[in-house]
Amino acid sequence: LRCHVCTSSSNCKHSVVCPASSRFCKTTNTVEPLRGNLVKKDCAESCTPSYTLQGQVSSGTSSTQCCQEDLCNEKLHN
């Protein structure tokens, strides 16, 4: 499996070949109103998706997206 693995304040891309144990490409997007943003993309052995309501961004939120195809975590939103 190939995933994008990177950390940034916005969308980022950096493709790597994951370890054999990794079954998921994972994207965690954290938005805090005073603290800024963090996008973290990784290979993952397990992944539990969590989605947040559209209107929550201004009050601080975090979401996790999971997918299982090569470079499927290229975009911030599947």
């Epitope: 304040s9 954290t30 805090e32 109103p33 005073l34 603290r35 800024g36 943003n37 963090l38 201004s58």
Partner: antibody, heavy 118, light 110 residues
């Protein structure tokens, strides 16, 4: 070029007011939270206040709460700090800073000096 | 008194490695990421490290960060004269609901 330029500092008597401004350029100002950080002579950095992109969230250090007011005008790409009831201990170099990456000030201005003295 | 604790000064000879420590508590470093800034004489602070150990773009890879529990450290390898500056650690504090800084560490290159 990404840039923050502070202005409005100066010498002021205790108890008086001052308004600092920060002009932003080179990035989409209304995408980011902005902050004021100060450094008193011979001291370390101290966070003063922060404001979210849409002014919906605002925070202050306990040392300035009730005296300072942060605001922003996204149409003018500008950040402000209204400082009332100034004290000698507010004497410092005041920086405005942009928050991009979580918990990190990735762009800083050169600072404007505020001196509170009679 | 700063919320985060740093040594006031450290020094090292050129090409050596120096480490600057930063001690906090469960409400800041223990729960949140650590950021490191460099302040060269007469200049504005500059972001070096964010999210504990990630190098900001354009920063030399001679700088590295690490964190364990409620403490963090900044290592500078292959020390150069231009590294002479003040270094500050910072973290968000959940109790104070804002960012907190260390008192700063002045690095002298001998």
């Amino acid at each position: 070029e990404v840039q923050l330029v502070e202005s409005g500092g100066g010498l002021v008597q205790p108890g008086r007011s001052l308004r600092l401004s920060c002009a932003a350029s080179g990035f989409t100002f209304d995408d980011y939270a902005m902050h004021w950080v100060r450094q008193a002579p011979g001291k370390g950095l101290e966070w003063v206040s922060g404001i979210s992109w849409n002014s919906g969230s605002i925070g202050y250090a306990d040392s300035v709460k009730g005296r300072f007011t942060i605001s922003r005008d996204n149409a003018k790409n500008s950040l402000y700090l209204q400082m009332n009831s100034l004290r000698a201990e507010d004497t410092a170099l005041y920086y405005c800073a942009k928050t991009g990456i979580l918990d990190a000030f990735d762009i800083w201005g050169q600072g404007t000096t505020v001196t509170v003295s009679s | 008194q700063s919320v985060l604790t740093q040594p006031p000064s450290v020094s090292g000879a050129p090409r050596q490695t120096v480490t600057i420590s930063c001690s906090g508590s469960s409400s800041n470093i223990g729960q949140n990421s650590v950021t490191w800034y460099q302040r060269l004489p007469g200049e504005a602070p500059k972001l070096l490290i964010y999210y504990d150990d990630l190098l900001h773009s354009g920063v030399s890879d001679r700088f590295s960060g690490s964190k364990s529990g409620t403490s963090a450290s900044l290592a500078i390898s292959g020390l150069q004269s231009e590294d002479e500056a003040e270094y500050y650690c910072a973290s968000w504090d959940d109790s104070l609901k804002g960012p907190v800084f260390g008192g700063g560490t002045k690095l002298t290159v001998l």
